[in-house]
């Protein structure tokens, strides 16, 4: 039993290393930025400068493409709930430095929680997304 679990853990690690979670990060960032835009922001906010290049394409077409690619990646973790949790935590950890303020962080977390469901996958049980940047050790 323990041996199987160790093998399972190694398999999860290699799955995570192979996975490209970037489309998930891009999809989620676009989603929360669109939400912010639709609620309206300070027109003089520097992030509203139309000439500043954004790492995230805000147009809807790009987002649906990112979502499709994201779901394809997450699908690899469908049969391993713990590995799915690790993938989501990795997304959270990767983006935590880029999130501005508590509100954006909460919004990102909310969207991240819904991500498996959006992809038609089961959300992981016992999965704590309250991670800090650089806060977790790997097993």
């Amino acid at each position: 039993r323990q041996q199987w679990e160790l093998q399972g853990d190694r398999r999860c690690q290699s799955q995570l290393e192979r996975a490209n979670l970037r489309p998930c990060e891009q999809h989620l960032m676009q989603k929360i930025q669109r939400d912010e835009d639709s609620y309206g922001r300070d027109p003089y906010s520097p992030s509203q400068d139309p000439y500043s290049p954004s790492p995230y394409d805000r147009r809807g077409a790009g987002s649906s493409q990112h979502q499709e690619r994201c779901c394809n990646e997450l699908n690899e973790f469908e049969n391993n709930q713990r590995c799915m949790c690790e993938a989501l935590q990795q997304i959270m950890e990767n983006q935590s430095d880029r999130l501005q303020g508590r509100q954006q962080e909460q919004q990102f977390k909310r969207e991240l929680r819904n991500l498996p469901q959006q992809c038609g996958l089961r959300a992981p049980q016992r999965c704590d997304l309250e991670v800090e940047s650089g806060g977790r050790d790997r097993y």
């Epitope: 853990d9 949790c85 690790e86 929680r113 049980q125 016992r126 704590d128 977790r136 050790d137 097993y139």
Partner: antibody, heavy 123, light 110 residues
Framework: EVQLVESGGGLVQPGGSLRLSCAAS????????MTWIRQAPGKGLEWVAN????????DYLDSVRGRFTISRDNAKSSLYLQMNSLRAEDTAVYYC????????????????WGQGTLVTVSS | QSVLTQPPSVSAAPGQKVTISCSGT????????VSWYQQLPGTAPKLLIY???KRPSGIPDRFSGSKSGTSATLGITGLQTGDEADYYC???????????FGGGTKLTVL
């Protein structure tokens, strides 16, 4: 008011069997995970087993797997622990607990506990 | 030997603040939610904190929980003699597919 009442404890010889029961009331039993937790005299808490709302998933402490069986009867709002091949180290107070674990992004936590029933394994 | 490590005992004077640590690994605290329990002498344990930081109704805000990496902490402010008890942390361990409890910490209010 949530109530959990254990019964079935007692003195049993090594190798013997016992069946613990827990009668639940004051909440919708069928919507909660349930858990058995034990505490040996003068020692700390030790989780024994979990059972999902519909009984479809069960988890056990390694040292009791294959000897203990957790089950539930939602129609009777009752939780059970069948204990076979009992050993001296199984001597403990056994608590029936309600587990607040939900379907996603939540943890196991035990928000209601019974008074406990003492199981003594001795020759 | 518990996989979750707690100090065996802590003590402080009434009115003071005390913290109880619970140290684990990536497969338990690092990935899963932590809960805390108080066990007064001769009674069943009582839930104090769940999902790392949440308090059930009826638990005073003198009790707080936090988590960072693979460690969790229970904080108690405004210590009262009635707080003398054993305190346990708990979490799920993904490697073992089991709930783990810490070894317990005896709090003495001097």
């Amino acid at each position: 008011e949530v109530q959990l009442v254990e019964s079935g404890g007692g003195l049993v010889q090594p190798g013997g069997s016992l069946r613990l029961s827990c009668a639940a009331s004051g909440f919708k039993f069928s919507t909660f995970y349930m858990t058995w937790i034990r505490q040996a005299p003068g020692k700390g808490l030790e989780w024994v087993a979990n059972i999902k709302q519909d009984g479809s998933e069960k988890d056990y402490l390694d040292s009791v797997r294959g000897r203990f069986t957790i089950s539930r009867d939602n129609a009777k709002s009752s939780l059970y622990l069948q204990m076979n091949s009992l050993r001296a180290e199984d001597t403990a107070v056994y608590y029936c607990t309600r587990n607040g674990l939900q379907d996603s992004y939540s943890g196991d936590f035990f928000d209601h506990w019974g008074q406990g029933t003492l199981v003594t394994v001795s020759s | 030997q518990s996989v979750l490590t707690q100090p065996p005992s802590v003590s402080a004077a009434p009115g003071q603040k005390v913290t109880i640590s619970c140290s684990g690994t990536g497969s338990n605290i690092g990935h899963n939610y932590v809960s805390w329990y108080q066990q007064l002498p001769g009674t069943a344990p009582k839930l104090l904190i769940y999902d790392n930081t949440k308090r059930p109704s009826g638990i005073p805000d003198r009790f707080s929980g936090s988590k960072s990496g693979t460690s969790a902490t229970l904080g108690i402010t405004g210590l009262q003699t009635g707080d003398e008890a054993d305190y346990y942390c708990a979490t799920w361990d993904a490697d073992l597919s089991a709930v783990l409890f810490g070894g317990g910490t005896k709090l003495t209010v001097l």
